[in-house]
Every structure is written in C-alpha cells, then in structure tokens.
Amino acid sequence: QVPPQYPPIQSIRVQFTRCENEKGCIITSPSKDETMKVQDNSIIINCDGFYLISLKGYFSEELSLSLYYRKGRGPLFSLSKVTSVDSIGVAYLAFKDKVYFNVTTHSTSYKDIQVNGGELILIHQNPGGFCAY
Amino acid sequence: QVPPQYPPIQSIRVQFTRCENEKGCIITSPSKDETMKVQDNSIIINCDGFYLISLKGYFSEELSLSLYYRKGRGPLFSLSKVTSVDSIGVAYLAFKDKVYFNVTTHSTSYKDIQVNGGELILIHQNPGGFCAY
Amino acid sequence: QVPPQYPPIQSIRVQFTRCENEKGCIITSPSKDETMKVQDNSIIINCDGFYLISLKGYFSEELSLSLYYRKGRGPLFSLSKVTSVDSIGVAYLAFKDKVYFNVTTHSTSYKDIQVNGGELILIHQNPGGFCAY
C-alpha cells in the first residue's frame, strides 16, 4: 500500500515593491501554484487555524505600517515610524478573514514609498481543520 | 478514493490576564476544542517534537518572566525587567514536559500584575512522531 | 480502518560549539533519527517549500555571521559584529540547496570562536510538496 501523502498545506508568499499613503502595499504573488489567493490586494483566508506570518521589507522612507486581518480587530503587526521590518508572528485566523496592509507615510517627497525585499509569507499550521473554498 | 485527511495537529492558545509574584501567570484556554490541555496552570506536552512557541503580553508593571518546560532545564524564554513581551521561539519538547510561567515583580502598587493581550501559543511541528496520552 | 499517519516531517536540529574565521561553524547533529542530513558541514535540503529556521548561540568573541543556502543568493540571516544570536526566520528552500555558515572574526585572540548554546533548527512547513532523495 502506498503511504498517505499530505494534501498541500495552505501557504503563500507575496511580494510588494511599493506602498501608498493611507492605502496599503500593492501585493503580488510571484508563483502560479500558491495554495492561497490574493484578491483586492488582500490575502484570502479559507482555513481556520494558526498561521505563521513573516513580514520583511526595506522602505525608501519612514512610514507607519499595520497588517490587519479583520475589521474591528487589532493588527497582526503594527510598526510606527520605521524604515524596515523583519518580523515573525503567529496568529489565529479564520475563514472569511482577509490579510491586508494599512500604511501612513510621514513625508511628502513622493506619493508612494518604494520597497526593497518586500515579502509577506503566511503558512497554515493546522491542516486538518475547517476549510471553505 | 477519498484523499487522506490530516489528523488534528497538537496546538493550543492560552490567555493570561494576570501574573502573581513568585508564582506565575494564571492561564486559561478560551477554546473547548484545543488539542492540548491545561492542568495545574501548565500546558501538558503529550507529543515529542519541535514546537513553535509564541508569547505576547503587555504588563501593568515591570516584571521578570521566564517560561519553563522541565525542572533542571533552562527556560524557553527569559525576560528581565520588561513591561512587554512579543517573542517567538522554537524548542524541542517531549512527553511529560509541562510548560509554565515563573514571574518576579519589582513593584508593590498592586498585589498582582495585570496583563493586556496576554497570549501563549504552542504548535507542534512534528506530527507523526511519538505521542502518549 | 486505521486513520492515516503523518509521514515524518523534514526537520533537523544541529549544534555548533565552535566557529572558524572565514570558514564557518562546525555543525553536528546530536540525534541519529533526524529526517534531514548534514554533509560537508552543510544541511542538505531535499524538499521544496517554506522552512522555519531558528538560530541561537552565545559567542566567546564578537563576530560577523551569515547563514547561506545557495551560491549567488543573499543570506538567510546576516549579523554584523555580534556576541550572540537568537533569531527566527522563514525562507523558501528547494531541493539541492545547502544551508551553511560563513563567519568573520574581528579579533586574533584565538584561531577559533567558542560557542555556548549554539543551535540551528530547520523545520519544513510544506509536507506534501516535491522531495528528492
């Protein structure tokens, strides 16, 4: 008998090269075969459970950046007046959540902020739990 | 043939809203359907393997806080004279280990220390390994 | 019917007690039953996917340390003029990658640097993906 294979784990890596004041960071998924999807500049959560979240980026100017997942809830990450981020977190997310950026810039040099190495990774930690597609 | 489902991953999120000097932080599990259990203010480890550990909290006063897993072993986390914690770690834990807090306070404004956003998450990273229940 | 078991997750913990200038840190795997292997002082990657990476160590002298995975790619971690490290990261690694240290010391007191608590952990986060052995 063939040993059971793992069904694919819900995970995604998105990149962002620019962020806009009072909007967010424009995210793109470089890989076609990600198991999670981007929609309206947000990462869509289909499966309940803990997620490992990695956020990296080097910004052209100082900004304040928050990563949200649900209206009326506190942010997953909140960084005030930074020029870079390299953070790891764990959070419980659920079906219908959407992970998105909110950005405030503190300068008027440019209308957007450029990002080097901008990367957001989400990896589901509870396969076997509830999912809805 | 139905593709195999994942058995549930051992994981737990406990919350703590207060810590007592020379005791620890009083932990409660808000969810009934956690796959790990709290007993005598400790999280019980049933499965050998690596665990992803996330610890967060904002304290009402300065304290020194350690998170232990086994008598005679060094702490998983040790923070001295802090007012907040937001840490992630990886550790190898084994059946019979118990994860618990030790706290020392440096002030006597109140008889205990209150905690906002106090959260400890453990997620097993090696399903398929040895477990005993 | 017996519920399906998880095949073992690719993971490894290596220890290092000394690092050599312009070489790296000498890594050993204390456990016989790791699911990943050490070869030529590097950890061999057989499976594509995200990896959770934990790096810890307390050094006898100041050093600059980088952790690489592929020639021509930036490091997984890069720390300049430090005496300790306690970092967690997430990275996408692939078959044929090799994880290894590069070290530069800034002193000539000794020809090598001793390390207390030197530990590198890798845990695969995408079981079910491509592996080659």
Epitope: G72, G74 | Y58, Q114, N116 | -
Partner: antibody, heavy 119, light 112 residues
C-alpha cells in the same frame, strides 16, 4: 513619576467641535487602556470614553455616543478626544485617566482641561 | 446603568474623629471572576481626583492606613480614622464592575 497632561480645552458655541489631547509619561503607555472622565462645574464625575491599549476597541457613555471619538497614538504616548456637535451640557473639566484594563481602577488622573460650550 | 448612591452628601468633622461614608449600588458589584470592583476616590479642593481604595478594601500605593474600605454586594463603607486637615475634600465611590463605569454624587468632608 506618572504624568498625564491634558490640553485643548476652549470656549466655543453649541454645535462646535474641539479636539482634546492627553500626553502621558512615566508608565508604559502602549500597555494601558486610557479613558476620559468629565466633571461639570460644581458636579460629580462622569466617565465619558475609553480605548483599549492597542486601539482595537472603544467605549462611550450614552450621552456622547455618535458625537465623541476617542483615539490614541502609541508612538506619541497621546490619547485624544474628538468632540463634535457640542452642547451646553458638555461643559465640564475633562480629565484624562489611566486604567490598565477592566480589572483595575482609574489610578492616575491628569490635571484636567476646561471645555465651555455657550452661546 | 448601575446607580451609585452616596450618603451623607456632606460631613463636618473635628480633627481626630472617625467619620464613615456610605455607598450603595443599585445592583451587586460582584463580578463573575469573584472580585467586587468598588473604588473610592478623593478630590481635594482645586485638584484632580486621586485613587484611595480599590477592590473594596485595598489601599492604593502611598495611601495612609487611616483609610479603610469595607462591604460587599451592594453596600460599601469608607472609614477615615483620626481625620486630619489634609483629608478635606470630596469623596467619590465608583464602580468598575460593568460599563458604563459610574460614580456616586460625592460626599464633601469639611474639617471644623
């Protein structure tokens, strides 16, 4: 030493708007829920609004719901009270007070700032 | 809302006397966590309020042991032993058991 310093009080006409500020020091501000309490001339204390340590939730007394907004800037250790559609009965000294969470009292208060609403 | 009723509205006392102030809540202040969130505050003339007592009977940092609180459920008392000139002001009870947090109308303590 804990300090809470309010500012922004003024005399204005009914229907007007005002923004009060409270700058905190001497304690880990970002850890604490913060509140505003007011005291009409010669009267007692009335709790007005509260905000969670991370800004995720806000609470108001019924008399100001929909007119007042509490907010905070943890980077600047400041809590704000935006007051719109002001009425004569909003005339009071407004105190900023720290209250770590629902399990703790109002343990330190600012000196207050006077808001007068009169035609 | 929980209504807090303080009596008497005012007190005139001589130094070294031991006055008491009563506070009644319109419903029990015992919360499901087993604690009773009843506090006492003092507002001295021209100053902002200051915390004296929390959780019915616990004195806050720096508060003289001449101040003591007691009671349970809906009925509470603040006792000031050997009153001093510096104790003059308006005393308020307050409840933190349930939103909206509410205060009594105050008891003005004057020294003869």
């Amino acid at each position: 030493e804990v300090q809470l310093v309010e500012s922004g009080g003024d005399l204005l006409k009914p229907g007007g708007s005002l923004r009060l500020s409270c700058v905190a020091s001497g304690f880990p501000f970002r850890n604490y829920d913060m509140t505003w309490v007011r005291q009409a001339p010669g009267k007692g204390l009335q709790w007005v609004a509260a905000i969670h340590y991370d800004g995720s939730n806000t609470y108001y007394t019924d008399a100001v719901k929909g007119r007042f907004t509490i907010s905070r800037d943890n980077a600047r250790n400041t809590v704000f009270l935006q007051m719109n559609s002001l009425r004569a009965e909003d005339t009071a000294v407004y105190y900023c007070a720290k209250k770590f969470n629902n399990y703790r009292p109002f343990d330190y208060w600012g000196q207050g700032t006077l808001v007068t609403v009169s035609s | 809302d929980i209504v807090m009723t303080q009596t008497p509205p005012s007190l005139s006392v001589s130094p070294r006397e031991t006055p008491s102030i009563s506070c009644k809540a319109s419903q029990s202040l015992l919360r499901s966590d087993g604690n009773t969130y009843l506090e006492w505050y003092l507002q001295k003339p021209g100053q902002s309020p200051q915390l004296l007592i929390y959780l019915v009977s616990n004195r806050f940092t720096g508060v003289s042991d001449r101040f003591s609180g007691s009671g349970s459920g809906t009925d509470f008392t603040l006792r000031i032993s050997r009153v001093e000139a510096n104790d003059a002001g308006v005393y308020y009870c307050g409840q933190g058991t349930q939103l909206p947090w509410t205060f009594g109308a105050g008891t003005k303590v004057e020294l003869k």
